[in-house]
């Protein structure tokens, strides 16, 4: 029986060009975590496997850093990074737990300020 729960950072926002940590935490279970996937709906970002270590998708290699812990750090954010991110915990003997984080990447306040006070 799956007794665990996934706690996530929920809905988060960050500025364009900045970075953000995606973090999930599995609690209320003694199950062993054997692999954690970080995914979007249509592609995998990274995998942390207990035996194989970290794998980062080539599409994200330049701006994704593993950690802290089982989390994932996204760098050099663009507005295209806005969307859903999933952490999938593969555990033994429980099975699979999934958490969801929604990230909104905002135009930086500097960019907004500059645009607002542009000289015609």
């Amino acid at each position: 029986m799956m007794t665990g729960t996934i706690e996530t950072t929920g809905n988060i926002s960050a500025e364009k060009g900045g970075s953000i940590i995606l973090q999930c935490h599995l609690s209320s279970t003694t199950a062993q975590v054997t692999q954690v996937n970080w995914e979007q709906q249509d592609q995998l970002l990274a995998i942390c496997n207990a035996d194989l270590g970290w794998h980062i998708s080539p599409s994200f290699k330049d701006r994704v850093a593993p950690g802290p812990g089982l989390g994932l750090t996204l760098q050099s954010l663009t507005v295209n990074d806005t969307g859903e991110y999933f952490c999938i915990y593969h555990t033994y003997p429980d099975g699979t737990y999934t958490g969801r984080i929604f990230l909104e990447v905002l135009e930086s306040s500097v960019a907004e300020h500059g645009a607002r006070f542009q000289i015609p």
Epitope: N37, Q43, I47, H90
Partner: antibody, heavy 118, light 107 residues
Framework: QVQLQESGPGLVKPSETLSLTCAVS?????????WNWIRQPPGKGLEWIGY???????SYNPSLRSRVTISRDTSKNQFFLKLSSVTAADTAVYYC???????????WGQGTLVTVSS | DIQMTQSPSSLSASVGDRVTITCKAS??????VAWYQQKPGKAPKLLIY???YRYTGVPSRFSGSGSGTDFTFTISSLQPEDIATYYC?????????FGQGTKVEIK
């Protein structure tokens, strides 16, 4: 228990549009997951067509993108496939399936055979 | 697109035999590979996900292994009800792609 059921015409004429419906019971298509269409020509392998996610976003196979539209009716808990300008090569069993991130296609409909012929 | 190449395309084995099917991805997909069983006239069934994890209710005689580009699916002791076609599939990135299938028959 989640169930998916495909329906639609079994015969479509060349150059016309193939239209299929997937009726989902036991789970709301707006709650979670990606809701997919996959096809299998007779005696051949499986080809992913595309999906509509619970939030309404879509993703299509580039090989079919110019001809495919996947949409949904949330009030009826159904999603749809439209494939335009069909040819004999589109003759296949069409499946709808629910995909879970990290797992794959865990739930499938029973499939419906669509033949393209004049 | 990521190509998934399965071998053999068909095999014949006796009840109780160990059966092994391999799948090669055209690029590194880490452990993002699933395996399906399809019986004639039926929809595929998910057996293995993330290369080595058995899906709910799948008998322990079915197992998977591998990472990167090379993957293996094993039936430790073939049973009459295992007669089917088996497919690998990458769940690394869209478009999701399948191997061409391996038909398993009883000798």
């Amino acid at each position: 228990q989640v169930q998916l059921q495909e329906s639609g015409p079994g015969l479509v004429k060349p150059s016309e549009t193939l239209s299929l419906t997937c009726a989902v019971s036991g789970y709301s298509i707006t709650s979670d997951y990606a809701w997919n269409w996959i096809r299998q020509p007779p005696g051949k392998g499986l080809e992913w067509i595309g999906y509509i996610s619970y939030s309404g976003s879509t993703s299509y196979n580039p090989s079919l993108r110019s001809r495919v539209t996947i949409s949904r009716d949330t009030s009826k808990n159904q999603f749809f496939l439209k494939l335009s300008s069909v040819t004999a090569a589109d003759t296949a069993v069409y499946y709808c399936a629910r995909r879970q991130v990290g797992l794959g296609f865990a739930y499938w409909g029973q499939g419906t055979l669509v033949t393209v012929s004049s | 697109d990521i190509q998934m190449t399965q071998s053999p395309s068909s095999l014949s084995a006796s009840v109780g035999d160990r059966v092994t099917i391999t799948c090669k991805a055209s690029q590194d997909v880490s452990t993002a590979v699933a395996w399906y069983q399809q019986k004639p006239g039926k929809a595929p069934k998910l057996l293995i996900y993330s290369a080595s994890y058995r899906y709910t209710g799948v008998p322990s005689r079915f197992s998977g292994s591998g990472s990167g580009t090379d993957f293996t699916f094993t039936i430790s002791s073939l049973q009459p009800e295992d007669i089917a076609t088996y497919y690998c599939q990458q769940h690394y990135s869209t478009p999701w792609t399948f191997g061409q299938g391996t038909k398993v028959e009883i000798k």
